[in-house]
Amino acid sequence: QESLSCDASGVCDGRSRSFTSIPSGLTAAMKSLDLSFNKITYIGHGDLRACANLQVLILKSSRINTIEGDAFYSLGSLEHLDLSDNHLSSLSSSWFGPLSSLKYLNLMGNPYQTLGVTSLFPNLTNLQTLRIGNVETFSEIRRIDFAGLTSLNELEIKALSLRNYQSQSLKSIRDIHHLTLHLSESAFLLEIFADILSSVRYLELRDTNLARFQFSPLPVDEVSSPMKKLAFRGSVLTDESFNELLKLLRYILELSEVEFDDCTLNGLGDFNPSESDVVSELGKVETVTIRRLHIPQFYLFYDLSTVYSLLEKVKRITVENSKVFLVPCSFSQHLKSLEFLDLSENLMVEEYLKNSACKGAWPSLQTLVLSQNHLRSMQKTGEILLTLKNLTSLDISRNTFHPMPDSCQWPEKMRFLNLSSTGIRVVKTCIPQTLEVLDVSNNNLDSFSLFLPRLQELYISRNKLKTLPDASLFPVLLVMKIRENAVSTFSKDQLGSFPKLETLEAGDNHFVCSCELLSFTMETPALAQILVDWPDSYLCDSPPRLHGHRLQDARPSVLECHQ
């Protein structure tokens, strides 16, 4: 049987060692013990008694089915306990009595049906994170379950087989920063929602089929809910159930962010918020994020005209990886407050983008992200976006563009342009002179000779440049990142000619460790202040004798340098 490996600070790793019991020889010097992925099955009352100073105990996936009542009695300093994914079919309050310092407790993925006969947590006054429940068997949440817990940073409840929720069970916790609920159906959602309305700041709903969700008024007095963020992950919605969900918003007037991740919409976007007061209740929502939305009938999707008014005050929208190929002009025109739009990983081409960025579209837009779409012409893209009078930042990275023409038009306020991973081989005057930040990393550039009088930051890593670009091209440059090119040397003159340069990242290049280069690096200890990745990323490529040595350590031969 293998043994534990412990470092000097008392962190002990015993993961995947085929232990069949808690190993002997544990000491008070241990601060952290990880025995995950073993076959321990049983923890006896004396197994951990020596670990009086243990702060972290991780017993994840170790086939534990029995823990003696006083097994943890000596662990008064324990702050982190992970018992997830074991075989514990019942939980005992006696385990947790001594753990007064506990901040993190993970009991998830064990086959219990309830949290036990009595309250488990009354002594855990310092608890910040609690994870409970499982996929198959956890079926009941009761009023006693959370007694003693008044405030939690994170509470995660996996209750995909929930059959009974006792009203007010979650109400006893007065403050929950982030509540994650895994519920397969929406049956108890309204009851739970009523109980957490005055305590939860961020509610995350996971794996829930909301297709049959129906709103009914909540039995709550006027509440000032602190909820700022609402997220749906892996949920299934219909047009009708979306309308019903909107009605919940009247209870969370401070909501500022809504997120949908990996959701499926079995509908056509034919939303019809039936009550006009919903509109004003969305008033404070500033951020809407949608990622990987699956719409089986996305070619029949409506133009969302029924919810235009809901979105007029939204400032940030992300719709990522959701097969968007066109945003209707009228929709764009209604997004009057929109400042940030991210349409990454979609299907936009310039010709359909033209429809989206029509006259009057996105009048407040400052940042547009079109990374990894189907854009093909930089010239057309710039021209189409001329309608966006306030655009300052454009990310069109990870599109495959035709060769750059000599001249292009761009929105006049544009200051930031991301052209990374676009396959460009040559930069031309198509790139606007107004730029302050330019990212052309991960392309096929072997030179850069474009005058950019206002450029403050240049990102040009992962290209094929053999030398640093000429400093006269960028009179006000502050930051240059030119890692992973083919730069063979740099000199005092070169660096000195960038009058304002504060940060240079030039590691992982093919440095020829000549006498000049090595002399310069030895004579200039201040290099460490400007070269942020110095010294570890600066290695000699040649001569062979010095290959792989750090520039800082490499020493030229006296013979070579004084010939």
């Epitope: 699956h294 070619y299 190929f325 066109l326 002009c329 010709e351 359909y352 029509c358």
Partner: antibody, heavy 118, light 111 residues
Framework: QVQLQQSGPELVNPGASVKLSCKAS????????INWVKQGPGQGLEWIGW????????NFNENFKDKAALTVDTSSSTAYMELHSLTSEDSAVYFC???????????WGQGTTLTVSS | DIVLTQSPASLAVSLGQRATISCRAS??????????MQWYQQKPGQPPKLLIF???NVESGVPVRFSGSGSGTDFSLNIHPVEEDDIVMYFC?????????FGGGTKLEIK
């Protein structure tokens, strides 16, 4: 440059299955949909369906739902179409094509000729 | 399904003249200001080649003598002046509704 290289001609017996391949190069495979189109001898074009390599989602012409299965191997940038329970009606040239902008087929493979005959 | 009817089935044209092929859809292929109609050219023994997408956008690399127009249900492909290389088969295709459908094709011939 963008290329879609399809597997060679197939001669198969009625009732059998066949798996046609379409190897993509010159573009990021997971960023585009791959469509399959049938062209019978001296006939027009018939859309079979598409698959998005990024998430494996598919959409079929109802006429081919029980006939064709679409898969991808993102590690080799290859799309596959398996045709089942073949009859002489399935004898045709089958094209794969890249779907751009969610709506148009801008690059096509050279086609695979399938002959179903005993 | 949206049915696309191309006319004529064959069209005899003189080199240097204008050829107009029409495509009528059984229902509108408009999608919020964009017509989701494409035109493809197919030479014998070759795959189809995209000429026009979104009814009027000429695909990169396609000669300027090809143009597309129309909206709603009626679309046309114009070739002017016709060259010998153009005397092949042409198909329209809609992507407004699944299943996507192609027209029956128009064969261009020399008069």
């Amino acid at each position: 440059q963008v290329q879609l290289q399809q597997s060679g001609p197939e001669l198969v017996n009625p009732g059998a299955s066949v798996k046609l391949s379409c190897k993509a190069s010159g573009f990021t495979f997971t960023t585009y949909g791959i469509n399959w189109v049938k062209q019978g001898p001296g006939q027009g074009l018939e859309w079979i369906g598409w698959i998005y390599p990024r998430d494996g989602s598919t959409n079929f012409n109802e006429n081919f739902k029980d006939k064709a299965a679409l898969t991808v191997d993102t590690s080799s940038s290859t799309a596959y179409m398996e045709l089942h329970s073949l009859t002489s009606e399935d004898s045709a040239v089958y094209f794969c094509a890249r779907l751009t902008g969610g709506t148009f087929l801008d690059y096509w493979g050279q086609g695979t000729t399938l002959t179903v005959s005993s | 399904d949206i049915v696309l009817t191309q006319s004529p089935a064959s069209l005899a044209v003189s080199l240097g003249q204008r050829a107009t092929i029409s495509c009528r859809a059984s229902e509108s292929v408009e999608y919020y200001g964009t017509s989701l109609m494409q035109w493809y050219q197919q030479k014998p023994g070759q795959p189809p080649k995209l000429l026009i997408f979104g009814a009027s956008n000429v695909e990169s690399g396609v000669p300027v003598r090809f143009s597309g127009s129309g909206s709603g249900t009626d679309f046309s492909l114009n070739i002017h002046p016709v060259e010998e290389d153009d005397i092949v088969m042409y198909f329209c295709q809609q992507s407004r509704k699944l299943p996507w459908t192609f027209g029956g094709g128009t064969k261009l011939e020399i008069k």
